[in-house]
């Protein structure tokens, strides 16, 4: 063991040391005094340090704890929130454009539809919103609620347009006809399919998001124990109170000590990893039906499709309603029935499609990425912290809590802080009730993500195939064959290049087809941050 | 005293290279994210680039992405902007800037509170 | 061209209040802080204000930042002919995952 450095006769420097910390010097002792009262700078021999000096210590120590802790946390927490405010925004810009490419379908190709089709339109795509802000609204009833108020306009506008006004009290009849007798085909039914999985799906990402924010909030702010702020000042403070004002602590004492104030943040770490994992399964599942961007996006072609199949079987469907509406109805009027030969060959057409270059699916692998270099965040905490405080490298001539040592010894640092005060004890008290709750909070959330109907390798191309999204052939069913058809094939490009997008909105004068596209451009996620800057020079 | 310092401006031709250095000291520098922000005679700024204070995570503006890359070590504290494929439009005072990040809630500021005092990069012919 | 809009000019006569706009979109003023930074003719950039309307030590009073959704704002009052300077706002975008700045306001004290 070196020879004690010779003591500091008159405090000064320990004097000048606290002054910063704490304005004016009557706590500070002008010589060396026995210190008998001291409760946790225990000392060997004449000590620079009163009570008030410990206590104020003690406070200083626990703040610096929390800000190391807030600035160990800051790069994710940005990352998180940036994030977050972007999907929420790009989702709301996806939502805008699906019902303003559904609008333009509607205005090119059925103008006479346009007056009510919006209203139904703007309604349905107002519940995709709600829906997908956590509101408690079906899906399915959504969808219902759309082709039960378009069938009736459909019918009275295109199928029976010299329909008197007289007779226009058949709407309700109309709208009960229209799940009767499937007047849209299996339309509806392939909507929902879409519709509420990707929203779903859409939903409980942001859900997820929104928690990884409430996670870091909470472990960002946790209030230390009066114990781990006498750990902390032993650690950072009590070598002053024998004028060694230079010596800095043993890295593994600070482990050591890190590991005690922690223990019940670092119970998060379990749950947090299976949060990440669970996150990187659903968006690696957030493709074709499970992707709100690809579904919503080309919705307007499915809805197309849907009134051309009643077009199509506009002459057997006036016949049945007019019986089945005839105490609203008088007569039949003049069918306005399409004939077969002014439909293009099923066989030909393909799916609109989102061309995902780099769009929101790009930018949800590349967060996953980033929070993937985040998986043992709070396992790592302790080792984080104890590197960004000053800590003695290679375990040598350090301050082991009691004395300056040539080298550290775990074993009988650990002695010296039993005698002090139980580390176990510390141990064993268990999280905080706040980690408690944001633990039960990620489990839950875990839970949700586990239980995800999401696709497993190939059977998601086996559903499709049930389910009718496949683009390129149709099935044996041809009149359920989805293609986009009238003013042929439109290809939808993405139109999420996000800067380009956030705040802006396309015109219903803009056709899908013939509006001008933005390029997507690479999206890089960003994660600056200030770690350590625990005495900021800003106010 | 809080200091940064640029270094390694000059004339260079089109499609040429230049390595802009910033040599820090005051302050811990391991501890700080760092940008590069420029600035056209004339002009208003524009950030360039920016690191992480590990040098693990780099980010750019599109105008730079694929020609120039940021760099730093920690151990001599000072930043490195490697600048290739340089064009005349890349003409600027180059400043090297201390960045801040706080976020409280679901709310967050990134500023730059250290600047130097700037290199110029002229890119001619 | 910017993604944050600032007027051109600004002026104003000694121990005038001034104010100088900022406009931006919800990716960045909309969901992140702003800050504003003084230059001075033939200098480096200085932060003025960061976090909306925080002061770093050796500011004087006198600048002052607020926000508004998407909008923010920078007021010097009892303006000075050293205050004679470009003014820059400046924030995080997270759609671009990159800062932004103002095209810089050049004021003007008569």
């Known amino acids: 063991q070196p020879p004690p450095p010779p003591p500091d006769a008159t405090c000064h420097q320990v004097r000048s040391f606290f002054q910063r910390l704490q304005p004016g010097l009557k706590w500070v002792p002008e010589t060396p005094v026995p210190g008998s009262d001291l409760q946790v700078c225990l000392p060997k021999g004449p000590t620079c340090c009163s009570r008030k000096m410990e206590e104020k210590y003690q406070l200083t120590a626990r703040l610096n704890m929390e800000q190391l802790l807030q600035s160990a946390s800051m790069e994710l927490k940005f990352l998180i929130i940036q994030n977050a405010a972007v999907f929420q925004e790009a989702f709301e810009i996806v939502v805008r454009h699906a019902k303003n490419y559904t609008n333009a379908m509607f205005k090119n190709n059925y103008p006479s539809l346009t007056p009510q089709a919006f209203e139904f339109v703007g309604e349905f795509f107002t519940d995709v919103s709600l829906y997908i802000l956590g509101s408690d609204i079906n899906v399915d009833d959504m969808v219902n609620e759309l082709f039960d108020s378009l069938f009736p306009v459909i019918y009275t506008q295109l199928m029976n347009p010299g329909l008197p006004d007289s007779a226009l009290d058949i709407n309700e009849c109309l709208r009960g006809a229209r799940r009767d007798l499937k007047v849209f085909g299996n339309f509806p039914k392939l909507i929902m399919t879409q519709v509420s999985k990707s929203l779903q799906v859409t939903r409980i990402f942001l859900q997820a998001l929104n928690l990884g924010i409430e996670v870091i909030n909470t472990t960002d702010h946790l209030k230390f124990s009066k114990d781990c702020g006498r750990m902390l000042t032993r650690m950072w403070y009590c070598s002053y109170c024998q004028g060694l004002m230079m010596v800095k602590p043993c890295g593994g004492y600070c482990n050591v000590v890190m590991q005690g104030c922690m223990a019940g943040v670092v119970e998060i770490d379990k749950y947090w990893r299976e949060y990440i994992l669970s996150l990187e399964e659903l968006v690696n599942g957030m493709y074709r039906i499970y992707d709100m961007e690809n579904v919503l996006l080309g919705l307007f072609s499915t809805i197309h499709d849907s009134i051309q199949y009643v077009q199509k079987n506009a002459g057997k469907l006036t016949t049945t309603i007019g019986k089945l509406c005839a105490h609203s109805q008088q007569r039949q009027y003049r069918s306005a029935y399409y004939p077969e030969d002014l439909f293009i060959d099923k066989k030909v057409l393909k799916v609109a499609h989102v061309e995902h270059e780099e769009t929101l699916s790009s930018r949800r692998r590349e967060l996953i990425q980033k929070l993937k270099s985040f998986i043992s965040f709070y396992s790592a905490l302790p080792g984080y912290i104890c590197s960004h405080s000053p800590v003695a490298e290679n375990d040598t001539l350090c301050w082991n809590g009691q004395e300056l040592v040539e080298r550290y010894s775990q074993k009988a640092a650990r002695n010296g802080m039993k005698n002090q005060f139980n580390l176990h004890e510390l141990k064993m008290k268990g999280p905080e009730p706040v980690v408690s709750q944001i633990i039960d909070k990620l489990k839950h959330i875990n839970q949700l993500l586990r239980t995800m109907s999401m696709p497993k390798g190939r059977v998601l191309d086996k559903n499709l195939d049930e389910e009718g999204f496949e683009s390129g052939d149709c099935g044996d069913d041809e009149d359920e064959c989805i293609g986009g058809s009238g003013d042929g094939m439109i290809k939808v490009k993405n139109q999420l290049r996000f800067l380009a997008e956030l705040a802006y909105d396309l015109d219903v004068d803009d056709a899908p087809g013939n509006s001008q596209q933005a390029t997507p451009k690479d999206n890089e996620i960003s994660t600056f941050h200030n770690l350590g800057n625990v005495h900021s020079p800003l106010k | 005293e809080v200091q940064l310092l640029e270094s390694g401006g000059g004339l260079v031709q089109p499609g040429g290279s230049l390595r802009l250095s910033c040599a820090a000291s005051g302050f811990t520098f391991s501890s700080y994210s760092m940008s590069w922000v420029r600035q056209a005679p004339g002009k208003g700024l524009e950030w360039v680039s920016g690191i992480s204070p590990s040098g693990g995570n780099k980010y750019y503006a599109d105008s730079v992405k694929g020609r120039f890359t940021i760099s730093r070590d920690n151990s001599k504290n000072t930043l490195y902007l490697q600048m290739n494929s340089l064009r005349a439009e890349d003409t600027a005072v180059y400043y090297c800037?201390?960045?801040?990040?706080?976020?409280?809630?679901?709310?967050?500021?990134?500023?730059?509170?250290?600047w130097g005092q700037g290199t110029l990069v002229t890119v001619s012919s | 061209q910017s993604v944050l809009t600032q007027p051109p000019s600004a002026s104003g006569t000694p121990g005038q209040r001034v104010t100088i706009s900022c406009t931006g979109s919800?990716?960045?003023?909309?969901?992140?802080?702003v800050n504003w930074y003084q230059q001075l003719p033939g200098t480096a950039p200085k932060l003025l204000i960061y976090?909306?309307?925080k002061r770093p030590s050796g500011v004087p009073d006198r600048f002052s930042g607020s926000k508004s959704g998407t909008s923010a704002s920078l007021a010097i009052s009892g303006l000075r002919s050293e205050d004679e300077a470009d003014y820059y706002c400046?924030?995080?975008?997270?759609?671009?995952?990159?800062?932004?700045f103002g095209g810089g306001t050049k004021l003007t004290v008569l």
């Open positions: 800037a201390r960045a801040l990040l706080g976020c409280k809630s679901a709310y967050c500021y990134y500023a730059m509170d250290v």
């Open positions: 919800s990716s960045n003023i909309g969901s992140n802080a």
């Open positions: 976090a909306d309307s």
């Open positions: 400046g924030s995080w975008d997270s759609s671009l995952s990159g800062y932004v």
